[in-house]
Interface confidence: medium
């Protein structure tokens, strides 16, 4: 099974070769290269020196080889870099190239969503409901769930909205939002609203959005 690797958008992924080199072979005897699942070459070290004529344009200038750890560093990660990678090592002998090692890695690229933000899109109408939108941007993969918590002195209610999502054509990052009409006809105390974004790994909470409800006015004194 391939080694699973996780790295973050715009950062660097380490793609290992995990070559034990038990025979202590010099790089000058070896051809080491990495290719992706479409057989596009990321990097080639030919007899100890990097060679670029095979490197695909999408990887050009984005890699660096660490000869101590036999690891390729892929820089400026994009979402489209996710997938399978192979490190392959050939030994150059007088009789020709002999494949002596192969290592498969599976790269997942993540991007942290921004802290969810609550924006009211209407005023409180006669203390009955409020329209609000909660949004979070520039994340990957798409989140599992987005919801709103309405907390009062006595209770907590969770509202699940329909999550709207859009994906950037270039970066492939997601922006997500939900719009809700939160009703509180019977509430007389102050409320705090939170927005929660759940991904496979994290739970992001917005800053609290407070609503201070005016106390009902007492009826005017009866004057006989």
């Amino acid at each position: 099974a391939p080694l699973k690797i996780q790295a973050y958008f715009n950062e660097t992924a380490d793609l290992p070769c995990q070559f034990a080199n038990s025979q202590n072979q010099s790089l000058s005897e070896l051809v080491v290269f990495w290719q992706d699942q479409e057989n596009l070459v990321l990097n080639e070290v030919y007899l100890g020196k990097e060679k670029f004529d095979s490197v695909h344009s999408k990887y050009m200038g984005r890699t660096s080889f660490d000869s101590d750890s036999w690891t390729l560093r892929l820089h400026n990660l994009q979402i489209k870099d996710k997938g399978l990678y192979q490190c392959i090592i050939h030994h150059k002998k007088p009789t020709g190239m002999i494949r002596i090692h192969q290592m498969n890695s599976e790269l997942s690229v993540l991007a942290n969503f921004s802290q969810p933000e609550i924006v009211p899109i209407s005023n409180i109408t006669e203390n009955v409901y409020i329209n609000l939108t909660c949004s979070s941007i520039h994340g990957y993969p798409e989140p599992k769930k987005m919801s709103v918590l309405l907390r009062t002195k006595n209770s907590t209610i969770e509202y699940d909205g329909v999550m709207q999502k859009s994906q950037d054509n270039v970066t492939e990052l997601y922006d997500v939002s939900i719009s809700l009409s939160v009703s509180f006809p019977d509430v007389t105390s102050n409320m705090t609203i939170f927005c929660i974004l759940e991904t496979d790994k994290t739970r992001l909470l917005s800053s609290p959005f407070s609503i201070e409800l005016e106390d009902p006015q007492p009826p005017p004194d009866h004057i006989p």
């Epitope: 004529d53 095979s54 020709g96």
Partner: antibody, heavy 116, light 112 residues
């Protein structure tokens, strides 16, 4: 000694295809890449692409994608380049060259003339 | 794409005199990790394929006379023929292999 021997001159009609061969000898064929370069009459050198035989990878100059197709036959130590949809501006001498980081041995060149 | 610009386009030099050809790259050809410049020089005589003279910017290919030398780093490179001989009449090309391959437009060297 290292030798790259290319196929003979060709005269082709516009719209047709041509396949140029490059037979290698004097070294282990799978140890090196083969580059293809063209030179139009009275013009400079233009890189077409590379085929890395030791791990079956091709890379093309963007200009020649869809025009040139590079292949190899390891059993006969021969590299091929096929040019499709020929036009008069494809008239040129086509060279193969053995290469690692630079092209140290070249074929004698194949003149392809495209004329109606 | 990396663009290589040679100068001059043509050069007439007396026998025994020095000929100097410049090659400028639109981006650095120096691999900072290995300290190599991915630049080569080729000589092409009429009706013949190109012949490798210099690689890694300054390493002479075996069998090439020592009157040919290469220098430079990064974006500026020079091929020098220290004492021009009649058999040196040819077109000279620089070529980079830092990002795929490209050639300069060529410099024609003639005898004055």
């Amino acid at each position: 000694q290292v030798q790259l021997v290319q196929s003979g001159a060709e005269v082709k009609k516009p719209g047709s295809s041509v396949k140029v061969s490059c037979k290698a000898s004097g070294y282990t064929f799978t140890d090196y890449a083969i580059q293809w370069v063209r030179q139009a009459p009275g013009q400079g050198l233009e890189w077409i692409g590379v085929i890395n035989i030791y791990y079956d990878n091709t890379n093309y100059n963007q200009k020649f994608k869809g025009k040139a197709t590079m292949t190899v036959d390891k059993s006969t130590s021969t590299a091929y380049m096929e040019l499709s949809s020929l036009r008069s501006e494809d008239t040129a001498v086509y060279y193969c060259a053995r290469a690692a980081w630079y092209m140290d041995y070249w074929g004698q060149g194949t003149l392809v003339t495209v004329s109606s | 794409d990396i663009v290589l610009t040679q100068s001059p386009d043509s050069l007439a030099v007396s026998l025994g005199e020095r000929a100097t050809i410049s090659c400028k790259s639109s981006q650095s050809l120096l691999n900072s990790r290995t300290r190599e410049n991915y630049l080569a020089w080729y000589q092409q005589k009429p009706g013949q394929p190109p012949k490798l003279l210099i690689y890694w910017a300054s390493t002479r290919e075996s069998g090439v006379p020592d009157r040919f030398s290469g220098s430079g780093s990064g974006t500026d490179f020079t091929l020098t023929i220290s004492s021009l001989q009649a058999e040196d009449v040819a077109v000279y090309y620089c070529s980079q292999s830092y990002n795929l391959y490209t050639f300069g437009q060529g410099t024609k060297v003639e005898i004055k």
